[in-house]
């Protein structure tokens, strides 16, 4: 009789579909993730099951608290889609699909500098390229640890370019670039390149 009542409750939307979520939607291969399956009904003892496509990954019981499923995303096919099933006695509802986006992390970019020296100015062209990592990649250029460019988005495996003109400086400057894609909290930096303070022969990047 209880099962019938629970199913009747479902018909009147007192037992809606569960919600499946994760704090991280963009992941890299080998990353551990937690998936949370929760239900609006906090008074029922609910059995939660997690599926990737039709493969059953695990089952947990809960009441009032979300079920937490810990997974490791090691292969592309493990991106999803995932669904969570909430079951009370013989009655069940499934969540909407949840899929991860698997992104390859960017490798440390290489910064190249080209300079055209005039009597009064240096026309500097900075090139930055990360040869590995999922596109798009956002590049930002720094001078003495201060950002001097906006984020430059590259949707192909071509270097980002940034031009600047400087009065012949009195002191040396250090340049580097940052590469970042959709992976949160994951950025890489190039080795710094130092520009000497005076022109002439001490300008190794200058076009003569």
């Amino acid at each position: 009789r209880k099962a019938v009542l629970d199913c009747e409750a479902m018909k009147t939307n007192e037992f809606p579909s569960p919600c499946l979520d994760s704090k991280t939607k963009v992941v890299m291969k080998g990353q551990n993730v937690s998936m949370f399956c929760s239900h609006k009904n906090k008074s029922l003892q609910i059995t939660y099951s997690l599926f990737r496509r039709k493969t059953h990954l695990g089952t947990q019981d809960g009441k009032g608290e979300p079920a937490i499923f810990n997974l490791s995303i090691t292969e592309a096919h493990e991106s999803g889609p995932y669904k969570c099933k909430a079951q009370v006695t013989s009655c069940s509802k499934y969540s909407r699909d949840f899929s991860f986006t698997i992104v390859d992390p960017v490798t440390s970019p290489v910064l190249n500098i080209m300079v055209i020296q005039t009597e009064t100015d240096r026309h500097i062209t900075l090139h930055c390229l990360s040869v590995n990592g999922s596109l798009p990649i956002n590049y930002t250029f720094f001078e003495n640890h201060v950002a001097i460019s906006p984020a430059i988005s590259k949707y192909d495996r071509e270097p980002a370019e940034f031009n600047l003109t400087k009065k012949n400086p009195g002191e040396e400057e250090e340049y580097r670039c940052e590469a970042k894609n959709r992976l949160p909290n994951y950025a890489t930096y190039s080795h710094p390149v130092t520009m000497p303070s005076t022109g002439g022969d001490s300008c190794p990047f200058c076009l003569k």
């Epitope: 018909k11 039709k54 889609p81 099933k85 009655c91 699909d97």
Partner: antibody
Framework: EVQLVESGGGLVQPGGSLRLSCAAS?????????MCWVRQAPGKCLEWIGC?????????YYASWAKGRFTISRDNSKNTVYLQMNSLRAEDTAVYYC??????????????WGQGTLVTVSS | DIQMTQSPSSLSASVGDRVTITCQSS????????LAWYQQKPGKAPKLLIY???TLASGVPSRFSGSGSGTDFTLTISSLQPEDFATYYC????????????FGQGTKVEIK
Amino acid sequence: EVQLVESGGGLVQPGGSLRLSCAASGIDFSSYYDMCWVRQAPGKCLEWIGCIYTGSVGELYYASWAKGRFTISRDNSKNTVYLQMNSLRAEDTAVYYCARRGSGVDDYYFNLWGQGTLVTVSS
Amino acid sequence: DIQMTQSPSSLSASVGDRVTITCQSSQSVDNNNWLAWYQQKPGKAPKLLIYDASTLASGVPSRFSGSGSGTDFTLTISSLQPEDFATYYCQGTYYTTDWWNSFGQGTKVEIK
């Protein structure tokens, strides 16, 4: 035209083995489906045997009664799915259908069927 | 096992009649609505009519409709046409420790 064509059926003695093939045309296996086998004994209802996912891992799903004697495999390069049947019994006599469904957990229904191939187990 | 029980097992009807077939599951199907209906004509493969208890499959005439949830489901043909004389099967799906895809025993719709 999208179609599934089964082959390999015929007469087999009890205890024997048979391998059925299902060739899919107009379907790109890389689009990822479950390719399934369903059988129907003469004058009886339909009975699900199992499915294989056409994606990289090729997850398998079997009816509990079919585990052990029945094996589903695939060759994605040929867009073909196979059903290996061992230790056949008279009650395995049926028309064997190849059927397709989506790969999601909620894709439980079969939306494309082959014409079927008859397997007769008799001495 | 899930047992799917259809009734009636056969019926006789005339063109234009309203026909109702029921399907009862021994336990609730998954998601409360994972039930499909198929039509099969002699010597032919089944054809999907309805899924998710009430969603019409592509290309299926609107005279077919489905309803129900949990354990009790109904297929209705609002006005029977000559091409509708066939056998109809329900299919329920459920996951326990394995997937179950259970078919009903069929309902044969014959000409009166």
